[in-house]
Interface confidence: medium
């Protein structure tokens, strides 16, 4: 069953290569367990960036080596992706699944275009 997922169209990563955006879903049911997956689409290839399953009202728990962190509040998930470089520029798609209880719902956002600009190296300063 389909579910609407909204996310911003464009986000610019900061100078430290960190980008944050909100993924909001219109929950048709009373989910207790939600799974959020971030997908990256570039050159028609889609790869999974990170995923987390969380209980409503609890924190998102990504794997220890994940580049993602996040918090949840109601039907909103605040996602942060770290360690981005210019080559990671692309469309980042938020996929939300209401895992439990039935019925299962799944929704995919239109994607957030994340632009990453590598910082210019600091020139050596002479004293």
């Amino acid at each position: 069953k389909a579910m609407h997922v909204a996310q911003p169209a464009v986000v610019l990563a900061n100078s430290r290569g960190t980008a944050s955006f909100v993924c909001e879903y219109a929950s048709p049911g009373k989910a207790t367990e939600v799974r959020v997956t971030v997908l990256r689409q570039a050159d028609s290839q889609v790869t999974e960036v990170c995923a987390a399953t969380y209980m409503m009202g609890n924190e998102l728990t990504f794997l220890d080596d994940s580049i993602c962190t996040g918090t949840s509040s109601g039907n909103q998930v605040n996602l942060t992706i770290q360690g981005l470089r210019a080559m990671d520029t692309g469309l980042y798609i938020c996929k939300v699944e209401l895992m439990y209880p039935p019925p299962y719902y799944m929704g995919i956002g239109n994607g957030t275009q994340i632009y990453v600009i590598d910082p210019e190296p600091c020139p050596d300063s002479d004293f």
């Epitope: 049911g29 009373k30 207790t32 367990e33 399953t53 209980m55 699944e97 895992m99 439990y100 209880p101 039935p102 019925p103 299962y104």
Partner: antibody, heavy 120, light 112 residues
Framework: EVQLLESGGGLVQPGGSLRLSCAAS????????MNWVRQAPGKGLEWVSA????????YYADSVKGRFTISRDNSKNTLYLQMNSLRAEDTAVYYC?????????????WGQGTLVTVSS | QSVLTQPPSASGTPGQRVTISCTGS?????????VHWYQQLPGTAPKLLIY???QRPSGVPDRFSGSKSGTSASLAISGLRSEDEADYYC???????????FGGGTKLTVLG
């Protein structure tokens, strides 16, 4: 091929305890929510309990709430049902059943069941 | 007392068409939850027969069909055969009970 094999059934006295196991194979166990369904002799099917794939969500029928505990060990691909304070009316064949890949849409695969008899 | 209501028995002769009804309420079938049907042959575990109201798993003959309307659903078996003699159960999720609910089962007898 999906296989579900229940064990742990037997004869137990009223007020006693029993732990049922369901060994799963042929699929990625942690991706599926699992259920226990029972059938008393000559009677219909009764859903007992369910647990989500992560183990984070559990649900129970009112008839067993507070007495039965469902759990899972995803590293061992095994589902459990701890049954305490057993009553004569708990006598039944207990089936474990797997939800579909869409997670919670229907009970698609069933084990062959294990018989629990509560009698003095 | 089952949450979903089915007739306790049904019968027909080989080649006939029989229908088994399943009536629920606003917290299960009427809430939009799908209805699923199971066949239980004597001495065996239940087997999925129809899922999501009208879908057949692979291997289930097209003689079996399902439908749903409002708070009710039905299972139809056409071209009845002796091997169809079994117990049939409907099931749906119930959001007030937070669990699966079943019908009481219908024992189908193939006469003659």
């Amino acid at each position: 091929e999906v296989q579900l094999l229940e064990s742990g059934g037997g004869l137990v006295q009223p007020g006693g305890s029993l732990r049922l196991s369901c060994a799963a194979s042929g699929f990625t166990f942690s991706s599926y929510s699992m259920n226990w369904v029972r059938q008393a002799p000559g009677k219909g099917l009764e859903w007992v309990s369910a647990i989500s794939g992560s183990g984070g969500s559990t649900y129970y029928a009112d008839s067993v709430k507070g007495r039965f505990t469902i759990s899972r060990d995803n590293s061992k691909n095994t589902l459990y049902l701890q049954m305490n304070s057993l009553r004569a009316e708990d006598t039944a064949v207990y089936y474990c059943a797997r939800d579909r890949v869409e997670m919670n849409q229907w009970l698609a695969d069933w084990g062959q069941g294990t018989l629990v008899t509560v009698s003095s | 007392q089952s949450v979903l209501t089915q007739p306790p028995s049904a019968s027909g002769t080989p080649g006939q068409r029989v229908t088994i009804s399943c009536t629920g309420s606003s917290s299960n079938i009427g809430a939009g939850y799908d209805v699923h049907w199971y066949q239980q042959l004597p001495g065996t575990a239940p087997k999925l027969l129809i899922y999501r109201n009208n879908q057949r798993p692979s291997g289930v003959p097209d003689r079996f069909s399902g439908s749903k309307s409002g708070t009710s659903a039905s299972l139809a078996i056409s071209g009845l055969r002796s091997e169809d003699e079994a117990d049939y159960y409907c099931a749906a999720w119930d959001d007030s009970l937070n669990g699966w609910v079943f019908g009481g089962g219908t024992k189908l007898t193939v006469l003659g």
